[in-house]
């Protein structure tokens, strides 16, 4: 359990840099994370909205806080979900 946990952790931390990348090859991963964010009401992988770098402006609606019942914070003048997605992803992987 702890070994697989460590592998998942390392993989997610490693892939954080893909969110701020601008190449075509990273787009598929970014789009998958965007869908995940909208479903689980979270933002980014490790550092929240900052993980997206300059892409934060590129994707409309990114991390947009649509649910007032969830913790939100201001980032670049916009309300975004406060919780990062890492714990949600780990839970999701564990269940599936």
């Amino acid at each position: 359990k702890s070994k697989s946990d460590r592998i998942v952790n390392e993989t997610l931390y490693e892939n954080t840099k893909l969110l701020s990348a601008t190449g075509e090859s990273e787009k598929q991963f970014q789009e998958a994370i965007i869908v995940f964010q909208e479903e689980f009401k979270c933002c980014g992988l490790v550092n929240g909205a900052a993980d997206w770098g300059n892409n934060f402006q590129h994707y409309p609606e990114l991390c947009a806080c649509l649910d007032k019942q969830r913790p939100c914070q201001s980032y670049n003048g916009k309300q975004v979900y406060k919780e990062t997605c890492i714990s949600f992803i780990k839970d999701f992987l564990a269940k599936n």
């Epitope: 965007i34 909208e38 479903e39 007032k68 019942q69 939100c72 201001s74 309300q79």
Partner: antibody, heavy 116, light 109 residues
Framework: EVQLLESGGGLVQPGGSLRLSCAAS????????MSWVRQAPGKGLEWVSA????????YYADPVKGRFTISRDNSKNTLYLQMNSLRAEDTAVYYC?????????WGQGTLVTVSS | QSVLTQPPSASGTPGQRVTISCSGS????????VTWYQQLPGTAPKLLIY???HRPSGVPDRFSGSKSGTSASLAISGLRSEDEADYYC???????????FGGGTKLTV
């Protein structure tokens, strides 16, 4: 080319029901949140409802809460709006739009008339 | 009564510059990005400006948007007859957990 095509509008009596559909093409439907926006004759735009890409989250405007239900079938690339207990004030052109807070593509709309 | 306030009408002559304002509060414009839509007579609305000042591809650079505090504005320079339309501002309202539009501004050229 992104296309959104609404259908299901028509004349219905107060208290009646109607189900609107929106057929989407030209993009990966399951990657996007979707919304319904309406416009009463000669009036401005009014947001109705939104749904997340995987249907996990739905959002409604206060005037339609408890009466309207938004849903989607990603295998059919189709968005739905089930409208119950319809009132005269629900009379409008109903537009289907891509995304939930930046509506980047719109359908041409379908007219719903609630009248006795 | 719309949550966002826009002037009902605006006008200008060809070549002129016109500005349309959109006023809100801390729970909508003050904390979320503003979007502008153009609705030509008898047609569906079209995205004009998103994230306060970004133009989608295909929208001429004559259209520009800005936001300051709880207000936003749309500027149209080099006005043309085909710009005659209704213009709506919109944003998410964090208090309502819903999307809100301005009442719309009818632009006459």
């Amino acid at each position: 080319e992104v296309q959104l095509l609404e259908s299901g509008g028509g004349l219905v009596q107060p208290g009646g029901s109607l189900r609107l559909s929106c057929a989407a093409s030209g993009f990966t439907f399951s990657n996007y949140a979707m919304s319904w926006v309406r416009q009463a004759p000669g009036k401005g735009l009014e947001w109705v409802s939104a749904i997340s890409p995987g249907s996990g989250n739905t959002y409604y405007a206060d005037p339609v809460k408890g009466r309207f239900t938004i849903s989607r079938d990603n295998s059919k690339n189709t968005l739905y709006l089930q409208m119950n207990s319809l009132r005269a004030e629900d009379t409008a052109v109903y537009y289907c739009a891509r995304r939930s807070s930046v509506f980047d593509y719109w359908g041409q709309g379908t007219l719903v008339t609630v009248s006795s | 009564q719309s949550v966002l306030t826009q002037p009902p009408s605006a006008s200008g002559t060809p070549g002129q510059r016109v500005t349309i304002s959109c006023s809100g509060s801390s729970s909508n414009i003050g904390s979320n990005d503003v979007t502008w839509y153009q609705q030509l007579p008898g047609t569906a609305p079209k995205l004009l400006i998103y994230s306060n000042s970004h133009r989608p591809s295909g929208v001429p650079d004559r259209f520009s948007g800005s936001k300051s505090g709880t207000s936003a504005s749309l500027a149209i320079s080099g006005l043309r007859s085909e710009d005659e339309a209704d213009y709506y501002c919109g944003t998410w309202d964090s208090s309502l957990s819903g999307y809100v539009f301005g009442g719309g501004t009818k632009l006459t050229v």
